[in-house]
């Protein structure tokens, strides 16, 4: 780690559309990049009538929204597609939802994902 | 090596739209953003808008909101930029570039709108 | 999402150095480390030289070295060569929740 930062080395890789895309479908990624740059790891879902569905996870590249979140957490109201990054080793492994309102307190509660 | 490849020039007449394409290979094209800059000629580099091709979240320039749509297809690791209602000043080089540093650029395509 | 300040044009014999400016505001070029500085020659497409306000991008010389103060960032290249003669544009990062912006461009010439 560099000044205690956790630097992401891998991240646990799943991919809805794996056939279509040919690829694994699930299993831990290895995360290459400029020797330089940070790396993070992503995860995107849908929430879909209330049920969770994992579109895709893996490792994601040097991206200052990514930078010290220990924590997969989508903060964005209502998208359309869920996305969150992290840092660290399989930081993407859980994921949550908790929206930036003014004034409400947030009431979702973390994801632990089960790839389908 | 990371190469981001664009479509071939075109010439379009004015109200018209236009659609670049930017294939992306020798990275995982899910692992970052793709951004559209253009450069009309002799002008500065111009930022059009961003495309997360992951989730399929973009973010466009409020001067091209309405008339730019940037879409992302994973299986071809192609991102795409159309802009419609074209205007003799669209007539410029447009580029894509990878991830939010812009580290990587296309080749540029050039479009000309002349009636 | 005004574009950035730079001046049009500063010049520089070979081996002497030479700053370029990027002035803006609190919330592009003053917020967090968000400025990148690109390298573009006529004809070229333009190249990533500093991001993140002074990390050198890989390859690039260590004559190139940026800064920021405030809401202004410089690019200072030391020990001019013929071939920095170009563009050079300064730009922030964008994706997620940031949107990009670029400067006007400063003709750089090696006299």
């Known amino acids: 780690a560099i000044l205690g930062r956790s630097e992401t080395q891998e991240c646990i890789f799943y991919n809805a559309n794996w056939e279509r895309d040919r690829t694994n479908r699930t299993g831990v990624e290895p995360c290459y990049g400029d020797k330089d740059k940070r790396r993070h790891c992503f995860a995107t879902w849908k929430n879909i009538s209330g049920s969770i569905e994992i579109v895709k996870q893996g490792c994601w590249l040097d991206d200052i929204n990514c930078y010290d979140r220990t924590d997969c957490i989508e903060k964005k109201d209502s998208p359309e597609v869920y996305f969150c990054c992290c840092e660290g080793n399989m930081c993407n492994e859980r994921f949550s939802y908790f929206p930036e309102m003014e004034v409400t307190q947030p009431t979702s509660n973390p994801v632990t994902p089960k790839p389908p | 090596q990371v190469q981001l490849v664009q479509s071939g020039a075109e010439v379009r007449k004015p109200g018209s739209s236009v659609k670049v394409s930017c294939k992306a290979s020798?990275?995982?094209?899910?692992?970052?953003?793709i951004n559209w800059v253009r450069q009309a000629p002799g002008q500065g580099l111009e930022w059009m808008g961003t495309?997360?091709?992951?989730?399929?979240?973009?973010s466009y320039a409020q001067k091209f909101q309405g008339r730019v749509t940037i879409t992302a297809d994973t299986s071809t690791s192609t991102a795409y930029m159309e802009l419609s209602s074209l205007r003799s000043e669209d007539t410029a080089v447009y580029y894509c570039?990878?991830?939010?540093?812009?580290?990587?650029w296309g080749q540029g395509t050039l479009v000309t709108v002349s009636s | 999402q005004s574009a950035l300040t730079q001046p049009r044009s500063v010049s520089g014999s070979p081996g002497q150095s030479v700053t370029i400016s990027c002035t803006g505001t609190?919330?592009?070029?003053?917020?967090?480390?968000?400025v990148n500085w690109y390298q573009q020659h006529p004809g070229k497409a333009p190249k990533l030289m500093i991001y993140?306000?002074?990390k050198r991008e890989s390859g690039v010389p260590d004559r190139f070295s940026g800064s920021k103060s405030g809401n202004t960032a410089s690019l200072t290249i030391s020990g001019l060569q013929a071939e920095d003669e170009a563009d050079y544009y300064c730009?922030?990062?964008?994706?997620?929740?940031?949107?990009?912006?670029f400067g006007g461009g400063t003709k750089l010439t090696v006299l």
């Open positions: 570039a990878r991830g939010g540093w812009f580290d990587y």
């Open positions: 020798g990275y995982t094209f899910t692992s970052s953003y």
């Open positions: 495309i997360n091709p992951v989730s399929g979240s973009t």
């Open positions: 609190s919330s592009d070029v003053g917020s967090y480390n968000r």
């Open positions: 993140g306000v002074s």
């Open positions: 730009g922030t990062f964008a994706g997620g929740r940031y949107y990009g912006v």
